[in-house]
């Protein structure tokens, strides 16, 4: 089974690289997850994304969980997911009506 992910190997400033030009086909039977690294810097929020094997992504996300402090300078958050394009933009919250 082949999964698609958003991929930007180098950090993108305030651009979560979730547009169609960043979509890639992951390596069949090897890369079964999408991963995302979000780093908070003084200049803004930096994003890196790629395909990954489940082991690679889980090693990184588990080993570096303590580095994730959203809203804090130099916070680094790693996330892994296994559905197509799941490392894209967060779903917009619906406004209450």
């Amino acid at each position: 089974l082949q999964i698609q992910c958003y991929q930007c190997e180098e950090f993108q400033l305030n651009n979560d690289c979730s547009s169609p030009e960043f979509i890639v086909n992951c390596t069949v039977n090897v890369q079964d997850m999408c991963q995302k690294e979000v780093m908070e810097q003084s200049a803004g929020i930096m994003y890196r994304k790629s395909c990954a094997s489940s082991a690679a992504c889980l090693i990184a996300s588990a080993g570096y969980q303590s580095f994730c402090s959203p809203g804090k300078l130099n916070s680094v958050c790693i996330s892994c997911c296994n559905t197509p394009l799941c490392n894209g933009p967060r779903p917009k919250k619906r406004g209450s009506s």
């Epitope: 003084s42 395909c51 990954a52 570096y64």
Partner: antibody, heavy 120, light 107 residues
């Protein structure tokens, strides 16, 4: 036990080619980036390039771009550095090292290095 | 490319001394900096990752600090086995350049 073992170094004439191997054991290379770093005699460390074996994605330092190629054979758990059009300034000890994809990780395991001498 | 400027290039110190080595990045690299120790004829060894986190098995006399562009490696009380060359490296964006190295010699 995690180990990286380089081999393939030796004496080669300018313009010649050499292929270095980096055999990994104790971990699976598809879970890491494999980086090549070199050190000329009496000089500092120079980052040469890296491969993500799970995708084959590579990146090279400008000094070797177009002449060196990094590849990996995941079935052998081994990475390679193919060096073509070698120059005297490529003379160095070549190390391979592993690093997680995450930016803040360090290169936690290194091979012992293999010496490449480019001379006529 | 991001440059890493390390200083001093060499220093002489005695056992028990406090030693400080600095590294400056040419642009903001957040905390994506590691420090390595290398002894003659040996491969480098990871000491510090993410600018300030001590790698497993490294003695607590080693510490790192900094973020953005300015980073420091400190050895609180130099031991005989610490005489070596130290390198900083960023891994913020390829190429992952190293500093020029600092050789710590016996006074």
């Amino acid at each position: 036990e995690v180990q990286l073992v380089e081999s393939g170094g030796g004496l080669v004439q300018p313009g010649g080619s050499l292929r270095l191997s980096c055999a990994a054991s104790g971990f699976t290379i598809t879970n890491y980036g494999i980086h090549w770093v070199r050190q000329a005699p009496g000089k500092g460390l120079e980052w040469v390039g890296r491969i993500y074996p799970d995708s084959g994605a590579t990146y090279y330092a400008d000094s070797v771009k177009g002449r060196f190629t990094i590849s990996a054979d995941t079935s052998k758990n081994t990475a390679y550095l193919q060096m073509n059009s070698l120059r005297a300034e490529d003379t160095a000890v070549y190390y391979c090292a592993r690093k997680l994809w995450i930016s803040i990780a360090g290169m936690d395991y290194w091979g012992q290095g293999t010496l490449v001498t480019v001379s006529s | 490319d991001i440059q890493m400027t390390q200083s001093p290039s060499s220093l002489s110190a005695s056992v028990g001394d406090r030693v400080t080595i600095t590294c400056r990045a040419s642009q903001d690299v957040s905390t994506a900096v590691a420090w390595y120790q290398q002894k003659p004829g040996k491969a480098p060894k990871l000491l510090i990752y993410s600018a300030s986190f001590l790698y497993s098995g490294v003695p607590s006399r080693f510490s790192g600090s900094g973020s953005g562009t300015d980073f420091t490696l400190t050895i609180s009380s130099l031991q005989p086995e610490d005489f070596a060359t130290y390198y900083c490296q960023h891994s913020y964006a390829t190429p992952f350049t190293f500093g020029q190295g600092t050789k710590v010699e016996i006074k």
